[in-house]
Amino acid sequence: MGRARDAILDALENLTAEELKKFKLKLLSVPLREGYGRIPRGALLSMDALDLTDKLVSFYLETYGAELTANVLRDMGLQEMAGQLQAATHQGSGAAPAGIQAPPQSAAKPGLHFIDQHRAALIARVTNVEWLLDALYGKVLTDEQYQAVRAEPTNPSKMRKLFSFTPAWNWTCKDLLLQALRESQSYLVEDLERS
């Protein structure tokens, strides 16, 4: 996991504010492969490049997510950017469409950690951020990172800052964050798991 996601993020972060807005609007009407659901308009329009990348990967998985992103970029006339994205994306295997529910034991999105899949919801809904930071300090977070997250004024901005470090994390680091979440806000983890 990761190379395609990073390529999508890189492409979206290189769009101007106006281009990103246009990208989202085109994404609402772009033809989708059979069985794939569309990202809800309300959620889509308020997303930044990072949120949108995570949403694309969680809805369409990395391979199709990158292909879809490239199609939209091409449709916007950004051929070079689309080409770069496809060149940077490794060919992965297909997966079950997001619109088709799989039983929990089949791991609907293999290789995608709970933390990655629910990034947007965790940013919006985690309230006990200080507790998380203390649990992760020294194991996952450096002193500098710890202080940077603490310096943010609101819980969502703290969580957004925390998530800015996760691309460098491995699976076990994400597990430690999930464990801390289970211990501090188990009801939230339960709710997200059901969703």
Epitope: S106, P110, L112, T172, K174, R182, E193
Partner: antibody
Framework: EVQLVQSGAEVKKPGESLKISCKIS????????IHWVHQMPGKGLEWMGY????????MYNEKFQGQVTISADKSISTAYLQWSSLKASDTAMYYC???????????????WGQGTLVTVSS | EIVLTQSPATLSLSPGERATLSCHAS??????LSWYQQKPGQAPRLLIY???NLHTGIPARFSGSGSGTDFTLTISSLEPEDFAVYYC?????????FGQGTKLEIK
């Protein structure tokens, strides 16, 4: 069909090194964690740790940290448990196990290897 | 670490009887508990996960319940093949831990 096939029984002397294996088939090796569970003769089960082959990161039970090394070779879909210097107290059955699913890191072990019996005796 | 204490250590019952096995956690583990069966010379076998979910292929006579710190595995009517050792395991936090086991033997 998911299968975990472990290497055969080993008889070793204290101080010797050992690497036992767990060959996986029936699913994409990099999508799920592989765990090692220890069982001393006539005793209960003890979780040693896991490896996530997708990025080769490992998590250890502190009790076994520094005593063993968990690794994986993606090219042959095989996980390993390794000792650099065995002790008599390492005598046990060692199982590799795969969770039902790793997505939310709820590690219920639905698939097990047949076990590798390691005997350490002078 | 979270300590799981199983009781009784040994349970002697006859085929056809109802078996009730308990597992107590040293701290709240929500519903993150599973149950395994192990027979001599065999690897453990998952029966129940997340407190009450019956794993694929496991007979309906097995059921699990509980949340927080107290959990129960119930076998409604014992079959001869059910006599074995049963372990509970928590998945709430690291290190993952198992109970010491309950031996279910024929009376």
């Amino acid at each position: 069909e998911v299968q975990l096939v472990q290497s055969g029984a080993e008889v070793k002397k204290p101080g010797e090194s050992l690497k036992i294996s767990c060959k996986i088939s029936g699913y994409s090796f990099t999508d799920q964690t592989i765990h090692w569970v220890h069982q001393m003769p006539g005793k209960g089960l003890e979780w040693m740790g896991y490896i996530y082959p997708g990025d080769s990161s490992a998590m250890y039970n502190e009790k076994f940290q520094g005593q063993v090394t968990i690794s994986a070779d993606k090219s042959i879909s095989t996980a390993y448990l390794q000792w650099s210097s065995l002790k008599a107290s390492d005598t046990a059955m060692y199982y590799c196990a795969r969770p039902l699913y790793s997505y939310a890191s709820y590690y219920w072990f639905a698939y097990w290897g047949q076990g590798t019996l390691v005997t350490v005796s002078s | 670490e979270i300590v799981l204490t199983q009781s009784p250590a040994t349970l002697s019952l006859s085929p056809g009887e109802r078996a009730t096995l308990s597992c107590h956690a040293s701290q709240n583990i929500n519903v993150y508990l599973s149950w395994y069966q192990q027979k001599p010379g065999q690897a453990p076998r998952l029966l129940i996960y997340k407190s009450s979910n019956l794993h694929t292929g496991i007979p309906a006579r097995f059921s699990g319940s509980g949340s927080g710190t107290d959990f129960t595995l119930t076998i409604s009517s014992l079959e001869p093949e059910d006599f074995a050792v049963y372990y509970c395991q928590q998945g709430q936090s690291y290190p993952l831990t198992f109970g010491q086991g309950t031996k279910l033997e024929i009376k």
